[in-house]
């Protein structure tokens, strides 16, 4: 079957995000991928969206992330914009209202996004073949 247009949009956004280095991409988020053996694909997407939403809600106006220079400010704003877009698209793909995120494990946002990109690319290669 054809790949969902949302999936392509997610991969495009993740490509942009993983190229970015900002003051806050080294901050930690809940690592939902650490123990996701018994988790459905939809649950994984829903939980990933939840983690991203928690991150940008908490750090959108964080002065440490906004930095002191214009470049740092704009890079952070761009990061938040992409995270919101990713969050929106992941919810669309998940089709779930809510999902629990209880893991204790942490990873940097940078590593979290790289892992998510790998998962999305694998999904894309399956649906496009």
């Amino acid at each position: 079957h054809k790949c969902d247009i949302t999936l392509q949009e997610i991969i495009k956004t993740l490509n942009s995000l993983t190229e970015q280095k900002t003051l806050c991409t080294e901050l930690t988020v809940t690592d939902i991928f650490a123990a996701s053996k018994n988790t459905t694909e939809k649950e994984t997407f829903c939980r990933a969206a939840t983690v991203l939403r928690q991150f940008y809600s908490h750090h959108e106006k964080d002065t440490r992330c906004l930095g002191a220079t214009a470049q740092q400010f704009h890079r952070h704003k761009q990061l938040i914009r992409f995270l919101k877009r990713l969050d929106r698209n992941l919810w669309g793909l998940a089709g779930l209202n809510s999902c629990p995120v209880k893991e204790a494990n942490q990873s940097t946002l940078e590593n979290f996004l790289e892992r998510l990109k790998t998962i999305m690319r694998e999904k894309y290669s399956k649906c496009s073949s």
């Epitope: 214009a70 704009h74 890079r75 914009r81």
Partner: antibody, heavy 123, light 107 residues
Framework: QVQLQQSGPQLVRPGTSVKISCKAS????????IHWIKQRPGQGLEWIGM????????RLNQRFKDRATLTVDRSSSTAYMQLRSPTSEDSALYYC????????????????WGAGTTVTVSS | DIQMNQSPASLSVSLGDTITLTCHAS??????LSWFQQSPGNIPKLLIY???NLHTGVPSRFSGSGSGTGFTLTISSLQPEDIATYYC?????????FGGGTKLEIK
């Protein structure tokens, strides 16, 4: 082509309010911050502030924080600047300009400017 | 706020001259500097961004250099259309600030 079209000249009374517009065309309006610049007759340029058309977030120069309001109307790709309680010091040419960025802000600059709106404050 | 100082404030020139305008920042701005040209009655026109990058369509007789706190704009073989006021602008941190300008006048 990329254009910023500003509203016409305005004559306003001291202590009232003035609102000028800047209509964008030829590019994705929500992708670039719009900045506002003031130029008094025969003088230099002064940065007033900026607005992100995608979400309406603003950042203002402290000197204008209490009197300037920046807004956007995404449906018409138009940015607005309102100046409250103007005095003769506010008689100036006001420009809107777009902040163009490349490579995740590896470089950025004002590449396109509106023609400017002349505001005259007089009783 | 970062202060930007330009010198000289005005300069008497002859067509064909090579001239250098200077801009000094009150603190380190790395290479976050733009140069603009403004002819009487016209809008500012971007010439140089990030200290030394020539904007699209700008003649190669314009060149910029510098980093940190000291910057220069050089115009070689001055043409009639170059008679204008030149402004530097720092893009290092908000609020963005401009120099007072250097006005070119024909001798």
């Amino acid at each position: 082509q990329v254009q910023l079209q500003q509203s016409g000249p305005q004559l306003v009374r001291p202590g009232t309010s003035v609102k000028i517009s800047c209509k964008a065309s030829g590019y994705s309006f929500t992708s670039y911050w719009i900045h506002w610049i003031k130029q008094r007759p025969g003088q230099g340029l002064e940065w007033i502030g900026m607005i992100d058309p995608s979400d309406g977030e603003t950042r203002l120069n402290q000197r204008f924080k209490d009197r300037a309001t920046l807004t956007v109307d995404r449906s018409s790709s138009t940015a607005y600047m309102q100046l409250r309680s103007p005095t003769s010091e506010d008689s100036a040419l006001y420009y809107c300009t777009r902040l163009k960025e490349y490579g995740n802000y590896d470089s950025f600059y004002f590449d396109v400017w509106g023609a400017g709106t002349t505001v005259t404050v007089s009783s | 706020d970062i202060q930007m100082n330009q010198s000289p404030a005005s300069l008497s020139v002859s067509l064909g001259d090579t001239i250098t305008l200077t801009c000094h920042a009150s603190q380190n701005i790395d290479v976050w500097l733009s140069w603009f040209q403004q002819s009487p009655g016209n809008i500012p026109k971007l010439l140089i961004y990030k200290a030394s990058n020539l904007h699209t369509g700008v003649p190669s007789r314009f060149s910029g250099s510098g980093s940190g706190t000291g910057f220069t704009l050089t115009i070689s073989s001055l043409q009639p259309e170059d008679i204008a006021t030149y402004y530097c602008q720092q893009a290092h941190s908000y609020p963005f600030t401009f120099g007072g300008g250097t006005k070119l006048e024909i001798k």
